[in-house]
Interface confidence: low
């Protein structure tokens, strides 16, 4: 019944193989997480040698801009003081192409670049065409009226005369294409003539005209090559380390990234901060929940309720005031002084008074809230939809006849969703390298460890069988009780003969990652060996001789 010399040699060889497997598995358990971390840190840096450099330079994610216009249904009634009534039209969808140029690596661990954007209408994804007509407030007229409110009456009367001469009215009927990319307006030429430099438009006025075929300013961001903790954070925008649009240092700060990638190794405690040139401010999104996008683990970040809150509700926003109701942000200081406001679509999360003042608005958390799904390990966005609304504050201004009897109201002009999701080859590569491979490595380390442990038991079993074969029943019983630690054993271990020594300490601890609870592998092995020791002789018909033994 005992093991022959050959069998013992084979058992020894298997034991050695087992030891190697167990040690390799344990080393992997210790080393793999730090190796993965090292690789991530190496490859998320903005460095031509890093894997994500081309992804950073030419974003492979297809972005779409979906625009929804608020078609004014009762312009004549509004001029008589009635409540505005609007109808949402759209979406009018544009494919957005982005590319970085003038990339300059500086010697202070930063890189400067310009990012250009171009938009291409997508008829198949749109609900309507660019030639659709929309009735909307004439921003130039109504904006100028509010701006002139406290100016001398003579000036306002001259303004009324100018508007009349140029055929300008409070509401206009324009095509989607004109509203988006610009329409010729004699008033633009007039403003540029008498107020040079005040207006960013040369001969055409369009809400998105500034964005198409142009850059969003010179960003200087940290590369993370020398200091990974600052990676992607904005150092300067247009040479400024803070802007001067607002009334407090905190509001003027340029915080976070440029809004495309974030530092790696995020936790639920991380926030997502970025500087938005369009909003002329830094924005901070908060962690909401963990999720999965196409098999890739993500953290969802959303806008906190305080994002557009006014100063009385959220004091840190005081610097963005003067404020109207809470939930809308006055962007006039960075939008040629026009009374324009930024908010969530349909005044979601804003003072209910705003949505109630306009018929046809239906704020909905599902449809109108923005989100960014980020892969927490790399800080790379997987799926995002940034939704914002642009509104105009309008009112009747004495002396400017075109404003009639308009009751003060914040009237939504349009809202847009800038959305993108990783797909195709990029997604497949990302999944393989950052989800599948680590998962395979993760399981491999435990499989190796388990296999090693099982192989290590072969010589143990062989030793037990040798003792059984010699017919030493008393010794067998004794050896069995000693194999089970804590059952009468004093100073002997379960490892057989002097040729075997216990495996290294690294193997003797197996920790469940993340929970902070550890179990001794030594006792796990012992109980396993005890079960083998008690069941093997029984299986071989030697039950009665070991009747007194119990497994642990």
């Amino acid at each position: 019944m005992g093991c022959s010399a050959k069998a013992r040699w084979a058992a020894g060889a298997l034991g050695v193989a087992g030891l190697l497997c167990a040690v390799l598995g344990a080393v992997m358990i210790v080393m793999v997480p730090s190796l993965i971390k090292q690789q991530v840190l190496k490859n998320v840096r903005i460095d031509p040698s890093s894997l994500s450099f081309n992804m950073w330079k030419e974003i492979p994610i297809p972005f779409y801009l979906s625009v929804y216009f608020f078609d004014v249904m009762n312009p004549s009634e509004i001029l008589k003081g009635e409540k505005p009534q609007v109808r949402e039209r759209g979406p009018y969808v544009y494919r957005e192409f982005r590319h970085k140029s003038n990339i300059t690596f500086n010697n202070n661990d930063t890189v400067s670049f310009l990012e250009y954007r171009t938009f291409q209408f997508q008829p198949s994804k749109s609900h309507g065409s660019e030639s659709d007509y929309i009735v909307m407030p004439n921003i130039l007229v109504l904006g100028a009226a509010v701006m002139m409110e406290n100016k001398p009456m003579t000036l306002k009367l001259i303004m009324t005369l100018a508007f009349t001469t140029l055929g300008e009215r409070a509401f206009m009927n324009r095509t989607v294409g004109e509203i988006m990319w610009g329409y010729k307006d004699p008033l633009v030429n007039l403003i540029n003539k008498y107020f040079p430099g005040m207006f960013p438009f040369k001969d055409k006025f369009g809400l998105f005209a500034e964005l198409n075929n142009s850059d969003s300013g010179l960003f200087t961001v940290f590369t993370g090559v020398q200091n990974i903790s600052r990676i992607h954070l904005v150092d300067k925008w247009n040479g400024l380390s803070k802007v001067d649009f607002w009334h407090s240092d905190q509001c003027n700060m340029i915080n976070g990234t440029s809004g495309q990638m974030w530092p790696p190794f995020m936790t639920p405690e991380s926030s997502l901060e970025f500087y938005s040139p369009e909003a002329c401010r830094s924005m901070k999104l908060m962690y909401k929940e963990s999720g999965v996008f196409e098999g890739i683990p993500t953290y969802r970040f959303v806008a906190p309720k305080t994002l557009f809150a006014n100063g009385s509700i959220y004091p840190p926003n005081e610097g963005f005031c003067p404020c109207l109701e809470s939930g809308i942000q006055n962007v006039s200081t960075c939008r040629f002084s026009a009374p324009l406001f930024l908010s969530h679509p349909h005044f979601l999360n804003a003072d209910p008074v705003l949505a109630e003042a306009v018929t046809g608005l239906h704020p909905n958390q599902e449809a109108h809230s923005l989100f960014l799904d980020i892969h927490p390990v790399t800080g790379i966005p997987m799926n995002c939809s940034v939704k914002l609304q642009l509104s105009l504050y309008m009112k009747s201004v004495a002396g400017i006849g075109q404003t009639g009897k308009i009751e003060p109201v914040v009237l939504p002009l349009l809202w847009f969703a800038e959305s993108g999701a990783m797909e195709g080859e990029t997604l497949h590569t990302f999944y393989t390298q950052l989800v599948l491979m680590p998962k395979v490595m993760h399981y491999a380390q435990y499989v190796l460890l388990a296999l090693g442990c099982v192989l290590l038991l072969v010589p143990v079993i062989c030793q037990i069988r040798s003792q059984v074969g010699a017919g030493q029943r008393a010794a067998r019983a004794d050896s069995h009780s000693l194999a089970c630690w804590g059952k009468g054993a004093s100073d002997r271990t379960l490892w057989p003969t002097a040729a075997w020594s216990p495996p290294p300490a690294a193997v003797l601890r197996l920790c469940r990652s993340g929970s902070g609870h550890c179990w001794g592998l030594r006792s796990t092995l012992a109980s396993f060996a005890c079960r083998v020791a008690t069941t093997l002789p029984v299986l071989e018909g030697l039950g009665p001789s070991l009747g007194g033994g119990t497994g642990s």
């Epitope: 936790t267 405690e269 991380s270 926030s271 908060m286 929940e289 906190p304 993340g514 902070g516």
Partner: antibody, heavy 119, light 108 residues
Framework: EVQLVQSGAEVRKPGATVKISCKLT????????IFWLQLAPGKGLQWMGL????????IYAEKFQGRVAITADTSTDTAYMEVSSLRSEDTAVYYC????????????WGRGTMVTVSS | VLTQPPSASGAPGQRVTFSCSGS????????VNWYQQLPGAAPRLLMH???QRASGAPDRFSGSKSGTSASLAITGLQSEDEADYFC???????????FGGGTKLTVL
Amino acid sequence: EVQLVQSGAEVRKPGATVKISCKLTGDTFTDYFIFWLQLAPGKGLQWMGLIDPKDAQTIYAEKFQGRVAITADTSTDTAYMEVSSLRSEDTAVYYCATDSVGAAGFDVWGRGTMVTVSS
Amino acid sequence: VLTQPPSASGAPGQRVTFSCSGSGSNIGSYTVNWYQQLPGAAPRLLMHTTDQRASGAPDRFSGSKSGTSASLAITGLQSEDEADYFCAAWDDSLDGPVFGGGTKLTVL
């Protein structure tokens, strides 16, 4: 305005169990993590655990693991913390709090529940 | 886990600074928060995200951080500032928040 309303003071004998409550008012309960903290005399504040009422997921500090159970009832917007096998060193003020401003930034606190463990 | 001196004092109008020392797994990795606790009351958030004043906190308070240490400064000390001040940060190894033992401020 978000507020956390805690239950009143409790006196228990060693070995007994105490369950204290914390009701959130003024906003959606499931939008907040509820943290529980212990302020024992001469010991300073210690974090005990937290619950995400959205999915009842809990995390406990290792020191309190096994003796503390945190639960949430979304129908009443209330979180509960039960401490079992009470000892005299559990005599403390127990606070619930939420951290709307991120990592350990507890901007809303309950008034605290005094638990006295005495034979 | 976070270390604070047990007491501090200052005369009205003076400047006083509180220190808070931690490690790489807490202050070294995360932002710091400061709390004020008046006798018999619940703690009140004073500073969050290291240097941001919480709602209602006077601008006499300011916070900063360097490496694994953080500090809170009060300029123009007032009698109503007499309270316990303690720091807090998230801790990776604990997977939860950790607090300092608190510093008792006495206004002379």
